[in-house]
């Protein structure tokens, strides 16, 4: 039961974790306008994400703009975009695995085969999260190195936006929850009790987690 | 609305040295930096550098490294940008221009109306 | 440093021609490319930032597109008050650079 708890709350965070990261690379809070002393730098507050930019003038009034064309982008903006959708997919991937190894699901009648799927599943929610940490990382890391560097002008200067903070939270989120989905399942057939219980059942298994959950992928 | 004003139109004898103002107005000064460009009667323009009007933190195109010397006073909003050993293909108007612009959409957006330099024997 | 190579250096086009200006860098400059219009006895204007983004109050008619090495300025559809001088500038890295300048002319 403890394994198909840890499963649970593996899979509950990772979709958690996706959701925060698909609102993550999708909301334009990446970079904001930075806040010198006690006073705005400028009028208007200006929001950058990886889609669209939005400038918020003094009247409360805001005007997005989507960026003009795919390839004209600084590539570093490019390679932001490219982590963000292939880290939502891979998740995604992750939760199709885990699905078929899911002990409710016939995608898979071997105990073992199923433990392995899990121990997959989780692996690849890893690797999403540590997909989405690097874009946010790496804009993090240029925001602060602009902040104080002396020839970046107070206008230009921005601060870590919300959408660093949820992709952080993705990141983290993704990775416990594939941790815990990695260490339920350290073989195919060291479950214990709860296993043996299965296997001699006639009932269906009392820990049928739902199939409906997310896998979760950060975003970027 | 936002200003630049430049200082009147100098003449030099080679050797010398030039200094041009640009008195910046209509906004928050020590926000943008400015930009100083230079062009020759007919011909293309030319990027000298810029100064950060907040802590005179300044960056300039190697070519005139050594030469070009940009200040700033921020009690009167005002860029200098002092050129020395001037020779006679140093004849050029001289803009000061403010540098905006967030994501990756940058540019000058202002500029100063210019000061013409004459250096001349 | 980087060198920026404006084609032609001049032409001549007719009211309502298509116009198209071409800026070549010696270097990749990851689309931090602005263009500017300079009317005779006047300063440059910004017409473009980002390579595409056109600046706000400038005719919808002006456009550029490009990426790597290779930008463009394109006029839809050329006007009289059009006639002027454009410059391409980099801003990929110092010294930003400009190109030598289109002078564009009404046959």
């Known amino acids: 039961m403890a394994s198909a708890g840890m499963q649970i709350l593996g899979v509950v965070l990772t979709l958690l974790g996706w959701v925060n990261g698909l609102v993550s690379c999708a909301l334009p809070m990446w970079k904001v306008t930075a806040f010198i002393g006690n006073s705005i730098v400028v009028a208007q507050v200006v929001w950058e994400g990886l889609w669209m930019s939005c400038v918020v003038q003094s009247t409360g009034q805001m005007q997005c703009k989507v960026y003009d064309s795919l390839l004209a982008l600084p590539q570093d903006l490019q390679a932001a975009r490219a982590l963000c959708v292939i880290a939502l997919l891979v998740a995604l991937f992750g939760l199709l695995v885990y699905l078929a190894g899911a002990k409710c699901t016939t995608c898979v009648e071997e105990k073992d085969s199923k433990a392995r799927l899990v121990l997959t599943s989780g692996i690849v929610f890893v690797i999403s999260g540590v997909l989405t940490l690097i874009p946010v990382c790496w804009t993090a890391h240029a925001i602060i190195r602009d902040f104080y560097n002396p020839l970046v002008a107070e206008a230009q200067k921005r601060e870590l936006g919300a959408s660093l903070y949820l992709g952080w939270a993705a990141s983290g989120l993704l990775l416990l929850g594939g941790g815990l989905l990695c260490c339920t399942c350290p073989s195919g057939g060291s479950q214990g009790p709860s296993h043996y219980m299965a296997r001699y059942s006639t009932s269906a298994p009392a820990i049928s987690r739902g199939p409906s959950e997310y896998p979760t992928k950060n975003y970027v | 609305q936002v200003q630049l004003v430049q200082s009147g139109a100098e003449v030099k004898k080679p050797g010398a040295s030039v200094k041009v103002s640009c008195k910046a107005s209509?906004?928050?000064?020590?926000?943008?930096?400015m930009h100083w460009v230079r062009q020759a009667p007919g011909q293309s323009l030319e990027w000298i550098g810029y100064?950060?009007?907040?802590?005179?933190?300044?960056s300039y195109n190697q070519k005139f490294k050594g030469r070009a010397t940009m200040t700033v006073d921020k009690s009167t909003s005002t860029v200098y940008m002092e050129l020395s050993s001037l020779r006679s293909e140093d004849t050029a108007v001289y803009n000061c221009a403010r540098w905006d612009g967030y994501v990756y959409y940058y540019g000058l957006d202002y500029w100063g109306q210019g000061t013409l330099v004459t250096v001349s024997s | 440093d980087i060198q920026m190579t404006q084609s032609p250096s001049s032409l001549s086009a007719s009211v309502g021609d298509r116009v198209t200006i071409t800026c070549k860098a010696s270097d990749h400059i990851n689309n931090w490319l602005a263009w500017y219009q300079q009317k005779p006895g006047k300063v440059p204007k910004l017409l473009i930032s980002?390579?595409?983004s056109l600046e706000t109050g400038v005719p919808s008619r002006f456009s550029g597109s490009g990426s790597g090495t290779d930008y463009t300025l394109t006029i839809s559809s050329l006007q009289p008050e059009d006639v002027a001088t454009y410059y391409c500038?980099?801003?990929?890295?110092?010294?930003?650079?400009f190109g030598g300048g289109t002078k564009l002319e009404i046959k």
């Open positions: 100064v950060n009007p907040n802590n005179g933190a300044t």
């Open positions: 209509g906004y928050t000064f020590t926000d943008y930096n």
């Open positions: 980002g390579a595409t």
């Open positions: 500038q980099q801003y990929g890295s110092t010294p930003y650079t």
